[in-house]
Interface confidence: medium
């Protein structure tokens, strides 16, 4: 009778993560009597995957009954495959021996490759906000995919970006891979509503790429423009001065009025109006009782936006042209929601 051969007909098997891998193995003879074992890898460091005689292998099932004496099909199924299961699997026939069974013959091996989907791309922007005309970096990361081939693209509002660098790690063979990409984006004043998108395409995604997004609203800071104007006289001795704070983002803003360098009033932007581009406008006004002043008044609108150094705009109010009303000591009056006198 011909000597037993162990046949592993599949040189390689490709399985998607989470699915079941079938590793085929048949023997050409029933002799010698002895059990079969499956290993991953060869040599002294090989890992036991299945032993029909002993051990607990909850993920492994046999295709046929390996303990049946005339069975020559030693194929196994491994359930819930993960990238960590990738490797070369050997079906090894043992000969019954005393006290231990003796390795008799091995199959040629079957390489198990695992197709694993990349994780959802995570896009991160810079830690600090930046202003228009500045270049900021965005990173995109995705992990756990296999095989290594992967395509990554960057978009800003649907327009593909070209200024980026991408690395897939590790460089050598691995059970799974990670991708890391950094894109450079130049901010504009209109970017409050803009999005940066990282798109990852992989064989496991069947033409339906994964996307990660970052809203530039979390990255951009649009500093305000200030305009201080003197409104027509409301009453004989009163002048209404307004400070228009335009096109700023984010909303966090504090405004201080100064009269000749002295703080008159401080308020926080609350009831703002939103522009189509996502930036905000706000207006504050000051009622100045000119009769309280003998000399010209320098009114300054000072704005601290989003924790940045204050910017200011001044307006010189000429008081000589206005007759002074005796007995009044009110220099300015807030006509906003919280009316109060500043002395």
């Amino acid at each position: 009778e011909e000597e037993l051969q162990v046949i592993q007909p599949d040189k390689s098997v490709l399985v998607a993560a989470g699915e079941t891998a079938t590793l085929r193995c048949t023997a050409t003879s029933l002799i010698p009597v002895g059990p079969i074992q499956w290993f991953r890898g060869a040599g002294p460091g090989r890992e036991l995957i299945y032993n029909q005689k002993e051990g607990h292998f909850p993920r492994v099932t046999t295709v046929s009954d390996l303990t049946k004496r005339n069975n020559m099909d030693f194929s196994i199924r491994i359930g819930n495959i993960t990238p960590a299961d990738a490797g070369t699997y050997y079906c090894v026939k043992f000969r019954k021996g005393s006290p231990d069974d003796v390795e008799f013959k091995s199959g040629a091996g079957t390489e198990l490759s695992v197709r694993a989907k990349p994780s959802a791309p995570v896009v991160s922007g810079p830690a600090a906000r930046a202003t228009p005309q500045h270049t900021v970096s965005f990173t995109c990361e995705s992990h756990g995919f296999s095989p290594r081939d992967i395509t990554l693209k960057w978009f800003k509002n649907g327009n593909e970006l070209s200024d980026f660098q991408t690395n897939v790690d590790p460089v050598g063979e691995s059970v799974s891979y990670s991708i890391h990409s950094t894109a450079k984006v130049v901010l504009t004043r209109e970017d409050v509503h803009s999005q940066v998108i990282c798109e990852v395409a992989h064989v496991t995604l069947q033409g339906d790429p994964l996307r990660g997004t970052a809203n530039l609203s979390e990255t951009i800071r649009v500093p305000p423009t200030l305009e201080v104007t003197q409104q027509p006289v409301r009453a004989e001795n009163q002048v209404n001065v307004t400070c228009q704070v335009r096109k700023f983002y984010p909303q966090r803003l504090q405004l201080t009025w100064l009269e000749n360098g002295n703080v008159s009033r401080t308020e926080t932007a609350s009831t703002v109006t939103e522009n189509k581009d996502g930036t905000y406008n706000w207006m504050s006004w000051l009622l100045v009782n000119v009769s309280a002043h003998r000399d010209d008044v320098k009114l300054t609108c000072q704005v601290e936006h989003d924790g940045q150094p204050a910017v200011s705009k001044s307006h010189d109010l000429k008081v000589s042209a206005h007759p002074k009303e005796q007995g009044s000591n009110t220099a300015a009056e807030n006509t906003g929601s919280n009316e109060r006198n500043i002395y």
Partner: antibody, heavy 122, light 107 residues
Framework: EVQLVESGGGLVKPGGSLRLSCAAS????????MHWVRQAPGKGLEWVSS????????YYADSVKGRFTISRDNAKNSLYLQMNSLRAEDTAVYYC???????????????WGQGTTVTVSS | DIQMTQSPSSLSASVGDRVTITCQAS??????LNWYQQKPGKAPKLLIY???NLETGVPSRFSGSGSGTDFTFTISSLQPEDIATYYC?????????FGGGTKVEIK
């Protein structure tokens, strides 16, 4: 000494149920496939069911499939046969038997119990 | 299912006689055939496994031969304690099947 002792037989009405047990001793029970074989009064031997050592592989005769369930508890060194929907033709002496070789089956039955009698009658 | 046809169903022989029982399988079963002895009121006992191998402790007057579909069981010199029914059994495939048995009596 290798020994198998069956129990659980008795008189039962048609349609009724019985659970047979087989207590094993004198060998490493978990390493051996086990069988149930029956013999109707004055008749020959009829194989009923087998269970491998794992026990991932189970086999039944067509005459009992869907009605009988073989199981084992390796921790208790015990083999069981749950018999439901019993019929008059299930009346027999039921033997449990072990395979001669550990981890393998298909070599036969080298040790038998003394048998337990099941009578199905109204 | 594999059918096992055993003959004769019964025989009577004298002490010291050579007794032969045959068993025919309905399909090739290689050498996956065992022979059992069952004495009245007792459990069966394995005598021969794999068609021709004598089980440990079984007297050498018992022997078996054959392969494929045709098998023979022989008692070279019948003894009084050999009074029993003998069964062949195939183990090539499930369901396991037994022959109908041969009842051996002393003349």
């Amino acid at each position: 000494e290798v020994q198998l002792v069956e129990s659980g037989g008795g008189l039962v009405k048609p349609g009724g149920s019985l659970r047979l047990s087989c207590a094993a001793s004198g060998f490493t029970f978990s390493s051996y496939s086990m069988h149930w074989v029956r013999q109707a009064p004055g008749k020959g031997l009829e194989w009923v069911s087998s269970i491998s050592s794992s026990p991932s592989h189970i086999y039944y005769a067509d005459s009992v499939k869907g009605r009988f369930t073989i199981s084992r508890d390796n921790a208790k060194n015990s083999l069981y046969l749950q018999m439901n929907s019993l019929r008059a033709e299930d009346t027999a002496v039921y033997y449990c038997a072990k395979e001669p070789r550990s981890y393998w089956h298909g070599y036969g039955m080298d040790v038998w119990g003394q048998g337990t009698t099941v009578t199905v009658s109204s | 299912d594999i059918q096992m046809t055993q003959s004769p169903s019964s025989l009577s022989a004298s002490v010291g006689d050579r007794v032969t029982i045959t068993c025919q399988a309905s399909q090739d079963i290689s050498n996956y055939l065992n022979w059992y002895q069952q004495k009245p009121g007792k459990a069966p006992k394995l005598l021969i496994y794999d068609a021709s191998n004598l089980e440990t402790g079984v007297p050498s007057r018992f022997s078996g031969s054959g392969s494929g579909t045709d098998f023979t069981f022989t008692i070279s010199s019948l003894q009084p304690e050999d009074i029993a029914t003998y069964y062949c059994q195939q183990l090539s495939n499930y369901p396991i099947t037994f022959g109908g048995g041969t009842k051996v009596e002393i003349k």
